[in-house]
Amino acid sequence: ARNGDHCPLGPGRCCRLHTVRASLEDLGWADWVLSPREVQVTMCIGACPSQFRAANMHAQIKTSLHRLKPDTVPAPCCVPASYNPMVLIQKTDTGVSLQTYDDLLAKDCHCI
Amino acid sequence: ARNGDHCPLGPGRCCRLHTVRASLEDLGWADWVLSPREVQVTMCIGACPSQFRAANMHAQIKTSLHRLKPDTVPAPCCVPASYNPMVLIQKTDTGVSLQTYDDLLAKDCHCI
């Protein structure tokens, strides 16, 4: 159940896809990745107010219990709902290899 | 890639499964669920320090970028890796029905 997409906190404040530019050094990959030199990392950032993009029944429960016991139960969290693929060219002992990753870049987001 | 299970913050402080007892009223279900009257809600709660139970490459990236830009990029978040099913007996217009939910109770947790 993908619930409401209206953010009660104001535009852009709730869970959504953001892009962060990162170098291989930023990612700690400089010693094992050759290419690409820079990654446009798409990630899920933002608040998850009541029922906003609730991923499933568990997220709805979490919202209810967080309202009741905010010190015990955290609010739902903004995480990837799916991913975009990416190719890295990696250094190996024998030269270079092509490595595909299906879980590297967030494609869209939900709250859970 | 399921990374380290050792919690550097001390026992029980990192991302793990917790059980929270909740009534139908707590969950806002009293008007549509008959049974069970009370649910032992299993959910994922706790901190996600560097590489602790990192769900995938995306979680590892998030850790690196959070270290660099803590005000922009949040730390990974503790969420369900899988779920346990649960049966609810629900009120319907014609009486009652048995409904199975596959996404209600967390089974185990990881950081993402």
């Epitope: 050759l34 290419s35 690409p36 990416m86 190719v87 060219i89 092509l98 595909t100 299906d102 | -």
Partner: antibody, heavy 118, light 107 residues
Framework: QVQLQQSGPELVKPGASVKLSCKAS????????INWVKQRPGQGLEWIGW????????KYNEKFKGKATLTVDTSSSTAYMELHSLTSEDSAVYFC???????????WGQGTTLTVSS | DIVLTQSPATLSVTPGDRVSLSCRAS??????LHWYQQKSHESPRLLIK???QSISGIPSRFSGSGSGTDFTLSINSVETEDFGMYFC?????????FGGGTKLEIK
């Protein structure tokens, strides 16, 4: 904007070698990888190999090992492909292609036509 | 090596038609499939990356779909400038390979 300017057409004799060039402009040369692609008249595309301009590390399609040698000159922002022991089968258009993401080819040179004939 | 088979080899259409071009891989390549257009005596141009991701500057009438072994490039209303050759390319593993191409021509 990113541009890859390739050298002009070549007519060479069988058994000889030839060195094709691809000069990059509009970006930092070491920021993009260079690939070389072969296209015979009326046919499809064949990937020859990849080179990492920062330090010249390269990867070849097994089919072109011994046939092609890829090099770079970072001082002139130029990539080179030398083709050896030429036969009529090597007559083709050769493209250099720049890749930011190594998965696909974003920027292409205009192609160099190589004709091998006695 | 991964073999990419494109079909049909030639497609004759009228401007305004919706067309679908197929690319089939000899083994699963997830989403690691990219599409190019090449007009006569020109260099190829990237149209779609990673099966379905759009490219800046490419008209929105071009779209891609598929995963695994079966992929489709769709043009929802063909324009005269769209005629030419279309190639798919995989980046799941080295060596990168291309399909044999589909020629889109005016009926």
């Amino acid at each position: 904007q990113v541009q890859l300017q390739q050298s002009g057409p070549e007519l060479v004799k069988p058994g000889a070698s030839v060195k094709l060039s691809c000069k990059a402009s509009g970006y930092t040369f070491t920021s993009y990888d260079i690939n070389w692609v072969k296209q015979r008249p009326g046919q499809g595309l064949e990937w020859i190999g990849w080179i990492y301009p920062r330090d010249g590390i390269s990867k070849y399609n097994e089919k072109f090992k011994g046939k092609a040698t890829l090099t770079v000159d970072t001082s002139s922002s130029t990539a080179y492909m030398e083709l050896h022991s030429l036969t009529s089968e090597d007559s083709a258009v050769y493209f250099c292609a720049g890749t930011y993401d190594p998965a696909y080819f974003d920027y292409w040179g205009q192609g160099t036509t190589l004709t091998v004939s006695s | 090596d991964i073999v990419l088979t494109q079909s049909p080899a030639t497609l004759s259409v009228t401007p305004g038609d919706r067309v679908s071009l197929s690319c089939r891989a000899s083994q699963s390549i997830s989403y690691y499939l990219h599409w190019y257009q090449q007009k006569s005596h020109e260099s190829p141009r990237l149209l779609i990356k990673y099966a379905s991701q759009s490219i800046s500057g490419i008209p929105s009438r071009f779209s891609g779909s598929g995963s695994g072994t079966d992929f489709t490039l769709s043009i929802n209303s063909v324009e005269t400038e769209d005629f030419g050759m279309y190639f798919c390319q995989q980046s799941n593993s080295w060596p990168y390979t291309f399909g044999g191409g589909t020629k889109l021509e005016i009926k």
